[in-house]
């Protein structure tokens, strides 16, 4: 059996995890891709996914998760902004390819988010201040939709809305970009 390996990332609350998951361009460019969390002993939970078919460079925002699929480069960029301690856990990028198993992209990501002041004088964090401008998205409310489409008859109330509005901005303070280097087996 193939041993699943992990890459560990330690970040502070409020920072951003920025992961780039590489994939084989010819095979998976337009395939639907997803970001999943795996809790101990539980089935993977799909937190966010691209559209079907996946659109090139089209940001999809679900809560604090932003997915961008760069077909030209064969990579899925995943950002989790304003990290919280409870975000700590094991994550993976996957490609849906039914009826086959979801295809996991490289190592799983062990995210450890700790409390603390990031970007303070004397800290060794590469912290910057950024404003990511997220263009309007047409995020599908249901994820994934790779098998049998399910119709939504009611959008969530505004308090739980997860689709960014036109010209909405996500203000990120003390952002640390973590670039994930793909490992080819």
């Amino acid at each position: 059996a193939t041993k699943l390996t992990e890459e560990k990332y330690e970040l502070k609350e409020g920072q951003t995890l920025d992961v780039k998951c590489d994939y084989t361009l010819e095979k998976f460019a337009s395939s639907q891709k997803a970001w999943q969390i795996i809790r101990d002993g539980e089935m993977p939970k799909t937190l966010a996914c691209t559209e079907r078919p996946s659109k090139n460079s089209h940001p999809v925002q679900v809560g604090r998760i932003i997915l961008e699929d760069y077909h030209d480069h064969g990579l899925l960029r995943v950002r989790m902004v304003n990290l919280q301690v409870e975000d700590s856990g094991l994550y993976q990028c996957v490609i849906y390819q039914p009826p086959k198993e979801p295809h996991m992209l490289f190592d799983r990501i062990r995210l450890v988010v700790t409390k603390g002041f990031s970007g303070t004088p004397g800290s060794n964090e590469n912290s910057t201040q950024n404003v990511y401008k997220i263009p309007p998205t047409t995020t599908k409310a249901l994820c994934p939709l790779y098998t049998s489409p399910r119709t939504v008859t009611q959008a969530p109330p505004k308090s739980t809305a997860d689709v960014s509005t036109p010209d909405s901005e996500i203000n990120l303070t003390n952002v640390t970009d973590i670039i994930r280097v793909p490992v080819f087996n």
Epitope: R64, Q154, T160
Partner: antibody
């Protein structure tokens, strides 16, 4: 339209093994999603027993784990439940359902259910 | 395990009136990263399996009348039937799918007053 149908003996003797099968139609199990068993004792609430993926990955309720086995047969598009060492407390309506816990977070759709009575 | 507590156990409401069912979880069922509450509501009529009404705490399933609505976040949730109809007489269950084992509330029986 996805439909599920439970089948199996309606009467099981104490200490024996309860065996049920859920036939899925209108959808290929091997295309994804998880598949669950839930039970409901007469006049009582619902209890999740466990779930399985088409690859065979299983997840069980710890309260029943030592006695439960869930398996899948993709060639027949069905999955099965075995509950060993049954007692009268296992008398219930047993339902199968598609488990969307990893996606939308719900069970949908459900089978009609089958009543299993444990009695000598 | 996350314990789901529903209240009241039973509820009698006049036709056309509002029915409100509460569900409280012992731990938060919110995944803050994607802002989703993994909380579902079901309707079960006698002799029938449960029918999904609401998932993600507030998203109505296809085909469910708009008099049914779900609200809440974290640990406190509400299912509201804005104008009770005769066909709404049933037992209603909440369920959490935030962490294993998946657990259900004890149910709330809704009747006509």
């Amino acid at each position: 339209q996805v439909q599920l149908q439970e089948s199996g003996p309606g009467l099981v003797k104490p200490s024996e093994t309860l065996s049920l099968t859920c036939a899925v139609s209108g959808y290929s199990i091997s295309s994804g999603y998880y598949w669950a068993w839930i039970r409901q004792p007469p006049g009582k609430g619902l209890e999740w027993i466990g779930s399985i993926y088409h690859s065979g990955s299983t997840y069980y309720n710890p309260s029943l784990k030592s006695r439960v086995t869930i398996s899948v047969d993709t060639s027949k598009n069905q999955f099965s439940l075995k509950l060993s060492s049954v007692t009268a407390a296992d008398t219930a309506v047993y339902y199968c359902a598609r488990d969307l816990g990893g996606y939308e977070g719900a069970f949908d759709p459900w089978g009609q259910g089958t009543l299993v009575t444990v009695s000598s | 395990d996350i314990v789901m507590t529903q209240s009241p156990d039973s509820l009698a409401v006049s036709l056309g009136e509002r029915a409100t069912i509460n569900c409280k979880s012992s731990q938060s069922v919110l995944y803050s990263s994607n802002n989703k509450n993994y909380l579902a509501w079901y309707q079960q009529k006698p002799g029938q399996p449960p029918k999904l009404l609401i998932y993600w705490a507030s998203t109505r399933e296809s085909g469910v009348p708009d008099r049914f609505s779900g609200s809440g976040s974290g640990t406190d949730f509400t299912l509201t039937i804005s104008s009770l109809q005769a066909e709404d007489v049933a037992v209603y269950y909440c369920q959490q799918l935030a962490s294993f084992p998946w657990t259900f509330g004890g149910g709330t029986k809704v009747e006509i007053k």
